[in-house]
């Protein structure tokens, strides 16, 4: 089943997010991803936890998952590199780099997204864009077309309240508000984009969606710049 968590959002403008990837297992959408280099897609490590024997592929240039589109192309994965410290039972270090079988054919609908290298928190209240093909309601309806929502960043101290995430949010994670608008199941691994720069990746822990007391949790890419650079090198 798809992992992670867009509720309360709307359909994205087609191909306006050319960095957006669908990580697929046996031909079905599993998680979001983001093209960070010509041959590399960044996603969440937990996405591949249950993918042991399945065929993992990456869809780029897509708006609709099912309809033919000139820019769409499915790439095989040459190498999957989860963060070495990621573990099944924690949300920490939930990053995965997927090396495509070949360099992506770039164009208006397929283009890498610059990612944040300066390890400084995004200011609370900043509106950031999260997109994905994750479920759009509590009944679990999966969209065919890419959805997105703008979410305000939430400060870490609030996010760490006992009623919220009770101390689980380290400096390597960030939160965004989740009051009816939220990332949801199937959005994991997708990008949180602030000011046109990739700041976070949707974590793939199981979490209730759209509840203001359970904010969305995102892995801060700037905190993993050294690791990302070392894998891409």
């Amino acid at each position: 089943p798809p992992r992670g968590r867009i509720l309360g959002g709307r359909e994205a403008e087609a191909h306006a997010r050319p960095y957006m990837a669908s990580v697929q297992l046996n031909g079905a959408h599993l998680c979001g991803g983001v093209l960070v280099a010509e041959q590399w897609v960044l996603s969440a490590a937990h996405c591949l936890e249950d993918a042991a024997d399945g065929k993992v592929q990456v869809l780029l240039g897509a708006h609709s998952l099912s309809q033919p589109e000139p820019s769409k192309r499915l790439y095989d994965v040459l190498r999957a590199v989860p963060h070495p410290d990621s573990q099944p039972d924690t949300i920490d270090h939930d990053l995965l780099l997927l090396q495509l079988s070949e360099k992506a054919t770039l164009g208006p609908a397929v283009r890498p997204l610059p990612w944040q290298r300066v390890d400084r928190d995004v200011a609370p209240g900043t509106l950031c864009d999260v997109a994905g093909w994750g479920i759009v309601n509590h009944a679990g309806r999966r969209p065919d077309s890419l959805q997105h929502v703008l979410l305000p960043v939430l400060d870490r101290a609030t996010c760490n309240r006992r009623t919220h995430h009770d101390g689980a949010i380290t400096e390597r994670l960030m939160c965004a508000e989740s009051n009816r608008r939220d990332s949801c199941k199937g959005d994991s691994g997708g990008p949180l984009v602030c000011g046109g720069v990739l700041e976070g990746v949707v974590t793939s822990g199981s979490r209730v969606c759209g509840n203001r007391k359970k904010p969305g949790i995102y892995t801060r890419v700037a905190s993993y710049a050294a690791w990302i650079d070392s894998v891409l090198a």
């Epitope: 609370p124 101290a157 609030t158 760490n160 309240r161 006992r162 009770d166």
Partner: antibody
């Protein structure tokens, strides 16, 4: 290990000002709000409010608006409670406690108000 | 403000007894209730959070239950070291109000 260490006992006169400190160690100070709790002699616990250590924004319970102020010295990982124009009813033990991620309390600061 | 009405105020029990303390919230606080123990001259100590979760290192004889407005805290087999005052607290919304406390005395 995680610790909250409060300043020592205070003896003040009515009308004076007191500032109680709560120094945190063993964790990233700005990751957790700090609560302040009042306990009058022989009485129960009274949540005064809290301060968001990340943004600096305080929240005060209704009974603690006006003469009471929470502040931070982030570089020293320290939260402060200041009480102005002290009254006899302010005589109590004041506790700081970390909000979330476990159970961490200061040892308490006893304030005596006497003319 | 949400009022937390805690009963009883005092309990006189013998070692080995089962003790039940209740807290009633003036409006729903879902499961956002904690229970604290405070021994004389000490800071409060968290025993139960989210109404029923036992905090790390807390003995199994301490249990909590409830949802919405009605909450119960139980000590299954009271021991001499349980002499203390017990408080409930709601952290559903600010102000994060406490109950009035229950003083537990051992015969």
């Amino acid at each position: 290990q995680i610790q909250l260490v409060q300043s020592g006992p205070e003896l003040k006169k009515p009308g004076e000002t007191v500032k109680i400190s709560c120094k945190a160690s063993g964790y990233t100070f700005t990751n957790f709000e700090m609560n302040w709790v009042k306990q009058a002699p022989g009485q129960g616990l009274n949540w005064m409010g809290c301060i968001n250590t990340y943004t600096g924004d305080p929240i005060y319970a209704d009974d603690f608006r006006g003469r009471f102020a929470f502040s931070l010295e982030t570089s020293a990982s320290t939260a402060y409670l200041q009480i102005n124009n002290l009254k006899n009813e302010d005589m109590a033990t004041y506790f700081c406690s970390r909000e979330g991620g476990g159970d961490y309390w200061g040892q308490g600061t006893t304030l005596t108000v006497s003319s | 403000s949400i009022v937390m009405t805690q009963t009883p105020k005092f309990l006189l029990v013998s070692a080995g007894d089962r003790v039940t303390i209740t807290c009633k919230a003036s409006q729903s606080v879902t499961n956002d209730v904690a229970w604290y123990q405070q021994k004389p001259g000490q800071s409060p100590r968290l025993l139960i959070y989210h109404a029923s979760n036992r905090y790390t290192g807390v003995p199994e004889r301490f249990t909590g239950s409830g949802y919405g407005t009605d909450f119960t805290f139980t000590i299954n087999t009271v021991q001499a070291e349980d002499l203390a005052v017990y408080f409930c607290q709601q952290d559903y919304s600010s102000p994060r109000t406490f109950g009035g406390g229950t003083k537990l005395e051992i015969k």
